[in-house]
């Protein structure tokens, strides 16, 4: 579509729309954002029951009915067609394209690096505490405790591979059985899905974008939670994962392989190791009850060390501690023996920022946490902006069709499975499901990928991360090979089982429906997203952890009534939506409960009261930053700034606070034309699709 008005499709019957239409759909702010974005130009919607306005000059084909918010937005081409450009314009366009690609790759690189640093920051802040979770002896007997420990540790260290490697070393040291390790692995699977949910929060500025991004991210969460909900009881009852993996491990005579290939790390490590380097062994040592490790710092100081094995005379408490009777003696007071002692000589210090600061782990962690979140947020905003400007017109159409279109009949069902393979392959390449799903999130947000397509990609990502773990297990030393391989296979089969549960039959794709539901709620009440994050990844696991420590009777005593209420509510909800007539009139809706128990509106009012004072200053800051950004990017003056403020303005308008006087021309395209501003195609104008 051309960027300026064109005649055509004139309304055939003007009398139809001028006066008499009474069954008017209310205009929603969502719709205005989602459909047909031109130059990011958006104008606050004045909330009156207006009739749809038609013109003989059809500018934008806006449907009169409210669109499905889950439909992908039309990424409008606001640039000049390639054929209409002169040679200079074409060259400039090519250079702009290359520049954008370089910028995109650069921001993507720093995005991945910031995820790595974020993981390090979380480990510094909560790593030691996470390690102590593992040293709890009740894990052996309580699978539920194992599950929540898996969730909490992975959330605290922001790395499922760290928590899995701790489990592997504990199994190898016989501190943990494979049976007890399986729930922890399930928990780690849940915990790792928090990363892309955090990334989705960064897109909170635009409601419709946020709706899609948050749903796209939480589809991973729901898949993991639902899989655990079904498979943990099955595993506790049958031990099928333990049995199957044991058979596989015992049927092969594995030799130690080479290290699993570090593919993406090869590029990111040189940068991230200049920021901080961690001694990951410390968390494992704490988990294995090593008292000396509790006082060690996680920040690595010495990167080059020389380890020398030497025989040393050491004192022992009694003759029983002697390596052999002939290698034992006394000095008259103490008993001595000869032991092989590894003496570590420090040769060269690491080359990261914090090496000479000698700050406590918590301080370094908090500093890195703030910096990495800012970089993550900044990179994400820039990635979304660049993608938004690139993915317009024909480019967008091609990409969206390629990614979201199914194979022709009768092979349409295969498309999802190919997506699973693509997700697994991509995750194997980047060596991290967090990185892959986090990179996917903004693409879902801006509408390049549908949630229906993101779902199998995410499932594939879950498989990909387990294949990496299997490779890493095959490369592990002899003493840990069996246990690490069995645990990696448990992880693999757990994800396979989850896919079989929640993917093959379209009806069973509950995670999509649940994620969309949560996306809708979060788009309306954006605070609910953070609320969800805190409840599902912190409060519930910590509560279960606390109750488990109190013992089975307490856990059952509290858990059973809670589970009963949840089941009751779900059944009632199902009956209300499917066959309400079965229910008594009072139970056909939730109105019999206080409003705060069945609606988020009162909660929203309370939260708005607390956050209100921060909204306007934040908005002003946002607007200033945006204007600066617009100046740097050379955006048109009409560029609508700070989408995050739009809802605030709408809210104020609804309350009768005038935000800006209504203008004659709210549509920028019309206003420019009317004021004689429509210019001939200029080579300097924004370059987008070919």
């Amino acid at each position: 579509m051309a960027p300026w008005p064109e005649l055509g499709d004139a309304q055939p019957n003007p009398s139809k729309y001028l006066e008499g239409a009474t069954s008017q759909q209310p205009i929603t702010p969502d719709k205005s954002k989602e459909t047909n974005k031109t130059d990011n130009t958006e104008v606050p919607v004045t909330k009156f029951e207006l009739l749809p306005t038609y013109s003989t000059a059809t500018l934008i084909e806006e449907p009169t009915e409210v669109d499905d918010p889950w439909n992908l937005p039309t990424l409008q081409d606001s640039g000049i067609k390639w054929s209409e450009r002169d040679a200079k314009g074409k060259i400039l366009c090519v250079f702009q394209g290359i520049g954008r690609l370089i910028l995109l790759l650069g921001f993507l690189y720093f995005f991945v690096c910031s995820l790595d640093v974020l993981s390090s920051a979380f480990q510094l802040v909560g790593g030691k505490m996470a390690g102590q979770f593992f040293s709890n002896s009740s894990i052996m007997s309580n699978p539920l405790l194992g599950l929540v420990i898996g969730v909490l540790v992975t959330v605290f260290v922001q790395s499922s591979s760290t928590s899995t490697s701790i489990v592997v070393s504990m199994v190898a040291s016989s501190l943990l059985t494979v049976r007890a390790a399986i729930p922890i692995i399930m928990g780690a699977n849940i915990g790792t899905s928090i990363t892309n949910t955090i990334v989705a929060l960064m897109q909170v500025g635009d409601r419709s974008e946020f709706r899609r991004a948050f749903a796209g991210a939480t589809v991973h969460d729901f898949f993991n939670w639902l899989s655990v909900l079904v498979l943990l009881p099955v595993e506790v009852a049958t031990h099928y994962l333990e049995v199957v993996t044991q058979l596989i491990v015992e049927s092969f005579h594995f030799k130690n392989g080479e290290d699993a290939p570090d593919l993406l790390k090869v590029i990111t490590k040189p940068f991230t190791k200049l920021i901080v380097q961690l001694d990951k062994k410390v968390i494992s040592q704490i988990a294995m009850n090593d008292e000396t490790a509790k006082n060690k710092s996680l920040v690595k100081i010495w990167c080059k060390t020389f380890t020398n094995m030497t025989q040393m005379n050491v004192t022992v408490p009694s003759m029983a501690n002697c390596t052999s009777p002939s290698l034992c003696w006394t000095d008259g007071i103490q008993i001595w023996t000869m032991k092989n002692v590894t003496y570590k000589e420090n040769i060269a210090k690491c080359q990261h920022i914090f090496v000479n600061f000698h700050l406590p782990d918590l301080a370094v962690g908090i500093i890195l946490l703030i910096i990495s979140l800012l970089v993550l947020c900044g990179c994400l905003i820039m990635i979304v902006k660049i993608l938004g400007s690139v993915l317009k017109g024909q480019v967008a159409t091609v990409i969206k069709k390629t990614i979201n279109t199914d194979f022709p009949f009768p092979f349409a069902w295969l498309t999802g499975y190919l997506a699973i393979l693509v997700g697994a392959g991509m995750t194997f390449i980047v060596q991290s499901s967090s990185v892959f799903t986090s990179a996917l999130t903004p693409l879902i947000g801006i509408g390049v990928i549908t949630i229906e397509r993101a779902y199998p990609l995410t499932l594939g990502s879950n498989i990909g991360t387990t294949t990496t773990a299997i490779l890493a297990a095959l490369a592990s030393p002899g003493n840990t090979l069996r246990s690490s391989l069995q645990i990696a296979l448990c992880h693999f089969f757990f994800n396979i089982s989850g896919i079989l549960l929640w993917y093959p039959i379209p009806f069973t794709r509950l995670p999509i429906r649940m994620a969309k539901g949560l996306g809708n709620i979060s788009a309306k009440y954006r605070w609910f997203a953070i609320f969800y994050l805190i409840i599902f990844f912190f409060l519930i696991p910590l509560t279960v952890f606390g109750l488990s420590l109190a013992g089975w009777p307490v856990l059952v005593g509290v858990g059973v009534p809670v589970v009963f209420i949840i089941i009751l509510v779900l059944c009632l909800r199902l009956l209300q939506s499917r066959c309400p007539r079965v229910l008594p009139k009072k139970l056909q809706n939730w109105n019999f409960l206080p409003l705060c128990m069945h609606s988020l509106k009162p909660w929203d009012a309370v939260i708005s009261k607390f956050t209100g004072p921060f909204q306007m200053p934040c908005c002003c800051c946002c607007r200033v930053c945006c204007r600066v950004c617009c100046l740097l990017c050379g955006c048109p003056k009409c560029c609508r700034c700070s989408k995050c403020c739009q809802d605030l303005e709408e809210g104020q308008e609804a309350q009768g606070v005038p935000v800006k006087a209504p203008e004659t021309f709210d549509n920028i395209t019309i206003s420019r034309e009317a004021q004689g501003e429509v210019r001939a195609p200029d080579s300097k104008t924004e370059c987008t699709a070919l």
Partner: antibody, heavy 119, light 107 residues
């Protein structure tokens, strides 16, 4: 050089006690054990016990437990052995000897104190 | 207690001769054995520790060997000043115990 000085002789009555000293010089007193050894013509060399002056830890031969008490004074770098309830069998030469660090060989010996129990 | 047995109470040798003094432990003591020389009217002097290690300042004609329960102390070229009592001592476990001693005399 390392030196251990002991008084030449002590004459004591049966049933009485004697406290003999071993003054050291030429090394750090608190780093090595101090052993006490009894020598009689009939019994040869017998180990009485040892003290670690660094923390006052002691070890005794079961045969001399209750009979000998080992102490050390860090300020004067002197080790002491008190023998109580003496009988004629206690008549012997008593040596203090410095233990080598980390094992029970004795590298430097005092000249010995000759104890004579006689009424 | 570990008993250290020196089978010869006396040994008679001429100057320049080679002498081997044996010592047997009642149980395995590894190599935790020391040898001392005591001249008449003097205090003992350490010659060998760890069964084979010569103490500083000890002439190399004095050597030690053995491990476990059987130990040998050798003077390869007997000198007149070597006339003395020789004791073995174990420090494998408390109480530390000494052998009865072997007296080296000149022929």
């Amino acid at each position: 050089q390392v030196q251990l000085q002991q008084p030449g002789a002590e004459l004591v009555k049966p049933g009485a006690s004697v406290k003999m000293s071993c003054k050291t010089s030429g090394y750090t007193f608190t780093t090595n054990n101090m052993h006490w050894v009894k020598q009689t013509p009939g019994q040869g060399l017998e180990w009485i016990g040892a003290i670690y002056p660094g923390n006052g830890a002691t070890a005794y031969n079961q045969k001399f437990k209750g009979k000998a008490t080992l102490t050390a004074d860090k300020s004067s770098s002197t080790a002491y052995m008190q023998l109580s309830s003496l009988t004629s069998e206690a008549s012997a030469v008593y040596y203090c000897a410095r233990g080598m660090y980390g094992h029970g060989a004795m590298d430097y010996w005092g000249q010995g104190t000759s104890v004579i129990v006689s009424s | 207690d570990i008993v250290m047995t020196q089978s010869h109470k006396f040994m008679s040798r001429s100057v320049g001769d080679r002498v081997r003094i044996t010592c047997k432990a009642s149980q395995d003591v590894g190599t935790a054995v020391a040898w001392y020389q005591q001249k008449p009217g003097q205090s003992p002097k350490l010659l060998i520790y760890w069964a084979t290690t010569r103490h500083s300042g000890v002439p190399d004609r004095f050597t030690g060997s053995g491990s476990g329960t059987d130990f040998i102390f050798t003077i390869s070229n007997v000198q007149s000043e070597d006339l003395a009592d020789y004791f073995c001592q174990q420090y494998s476990s408390n109480p530390l115990t000494f052998g009865a001693g072997t007296k080296l005399e000149l022929k």
